[in-house]
């Protein structure tokens, strides 16, 4: 029995619903009374949802899963996962049993966009060319871990003297803090780019220092 799932991971935003697609080819004369379907976590084999004896046996996964009952008879064994959380990320196996059996695994990739970075400067007054300043770029509640890039006003990457830390909160979302230590020129713009590698989403922040005063676009 051939069970088909998408090759590419299913990407779902935190808090939204995701559909984990799974299908099989019913033979002529197939009825739902003949179908047994199991969804489970691939690694731990934890039961997620099942269909047996002609009826939905329900969710065993925080009551956030559902099948598509009207589509099962056509061979659509997809699973709806509601209110996706970071902890849901991973591989799900769809096991189908009729008079033969088959299974396939589909990956769920969870993502959350990062907020627009906030920029802070230390020290933030009485700055002169030649002073060393610390610029902090902070972006919040994203997933997975971000890639952080710094550049100057001419677009030249700044890779030295950069320290980036990422801390996960209770929901598994990351807060990013990236610190750039730089010696001031006569004036200059410093930009921070926080990239979500899954969503290919970039969040930008910048600070421009023009002697006095400073501006934070």
């Amino acid at each position: 029995l051939e069970v088909q799932v998408p090759e590419d991971p299913v990407v779902a935003l935190v808090g939204t619903d995701a559909t984990l697609c799974c299908s099989f080819s019913p033979e002529p004369g197939f009825s739902l009374a003949q179908l047994n379907l199991i969804w489970q976590l691939t690694d731990t084999k934890q039961l997620v949802h099942s269909f047996a004896e002609g009826q939905d046996q329900g969710s065993a996964y925080a009551n956030r899963t559902a099948l598509f009952p009207d589509l099962l008879a056509q061979g659509n064994a997809s699973l709806r996962l509601q209110r996706v959380r970071v902890a849901d990320e991973g591989s799900f196996t769809c096991f189908v049993s009729i008079r033969d059996f088959g299974s396939a695994a589909v990956s769920l990739q969870v993502a959350a966009p990062y907020s627009k970075p906030s920029m802070t400067l230390e020290p933030n007054k009485d700055l002169r060319p030649g002073d060393t300043v610390t610029i902090t770029c902070s972006s919040y509640r994203g997933y997975p871990e971000a890639e952080v890039f710094w550049q100057d006003g001419q677009g030249v990457p700044l890779t030295g003297n950069v320290t980036t830390s990422q801390m996960a909160n209770e929901q598994g979302l990351f807060d990013v803090h990236s610190v750039l230590r730089v010696v001031l020129g006569a004036n200059g713009t410093y930009s921070c780019l926080v990239r979500n590698p899954v969503l290919q989403q970039d969040a930008h922040g910048s600070v421009t220092i023009t002697g006095q005063p400073m501006t934070f676009p």
Epitope: S50, F95, R99
Partner: antibody, heavy 118, light 110 residues
Framework: EVQLLESGGGLLQPGGSLRLSCAAS????????MHWVRQAPGKGLEWVAA????????YYADSVEGRFTISRDNSKNTLYLQMNSLRAEDTAVYYC???????????WGQGTTVTVSS | QSVLTQPPSASGTPGQRVTISCSGS????????VNWYQQLPGTAPKLLIY???LRPSGVPDRFSGSKSGTSASLAISGLQSEDEADYYC???????????FGGGTKLTVL
């Protein structure tokens, strides 16, 4: 008539190897999953391994994983069980069974006896 | 030790009704179904009940099955001497990815 006929059993020493065969007839062999189930003397039934119709999905009991290999040749309507590194506790009657709806096994062979003893 | 739990023995007199229980878990009987097999002395097992309550053709209607939650039972009414056999329940265990059998119940017709 639907029939399953096992063969290949015998007496051998611990560490030895054996291949069981199961010849199927009377049904479309290539459309059904198949199992091996065993029964030690005076004991209950123990599921050993299963294979789906085209051999793409295989499952084993923990007790035989890594030592036994289930396979099938649909052109010959035959199911196999290759048993390596045999142990005394593998002594049993081995049954070949046909998969049926709802995880059931609706046709059983007569069994073939495997005895592992030094 | 079996994943599915059955009483090791049961007995009854001819004409009586006997019931054999099979206890499982959320990941086997609770998630899927249960099947019952009869093994007469010296013979191969035979499918008696599938999908908890269905009888294959040729199985007398004296045999019936039911399932509730994570447990199942096999009932034999109008007990006959030829019903003396070992009875096994079985299921698919979704947490082990294996087929599992109960330890078997030896039915004696007194």
């Amino acid at each position: 008539e639907v029939q399953l006929l096992e063969s290949g059993g015998g007496l051998l020493q611990p560490g030895g190897s054996l291949r069981l065969s199961c010849a199927a007839s009377g049904f479309s062999f290539s459309s059904y999953g198949m199992h091996w189930v065993r029964q030690a003397p005076g004991k209950g039934l123990e599921w050993v391994a299963a294979i789906n119709s085209d051999g793409s999905r295989i499952y084993y009991a923990d007790s035989v994983e890594g030592r036994f290999t289930i396979s099938r040749d649909n052109s010959k309507n035959t199911l196999y069980l290759q048993m390596n590194s045999l142990r005394a506790e593998d002594t049993a009657v081995y049954y070949c069974t046909k998969y049926y709806y709802h995880y059931a096994m609706d046709v059983w062979g007569q069994g073939t006896t495997v005895t592992v003893s030094s | 030790q079996s994943v599915l739990t059955q009483p090791p023995s049961a007995s009854g007199t001819p004409g009586q009704r006997v019931t054999i229980s099979c206890s499982g878990s959320r990941s086997d009987i609770g998630a899927t179904t249960v099947n019952w097999y009869q093994q007469l002395p010296g013979t191969a097992p035979k499918l008696l009940i599938y999908q908890s309550h269905l009888r294959p053709s040729g199985v007398p209607d004296r045999f019936s099955g039911s399932k509730s939650g994570t447990s199942a039972s096999l009932a034999i009414s109008g007990l006959q001497s030829e019903d003396e056999a070992d009875y096994y329940c079985a299921s698919w265990d979704a947490s082990l990815n294996t087929w599992v059998f109960g330890g078997g119940t030896k039915l004696t017709v007194l």
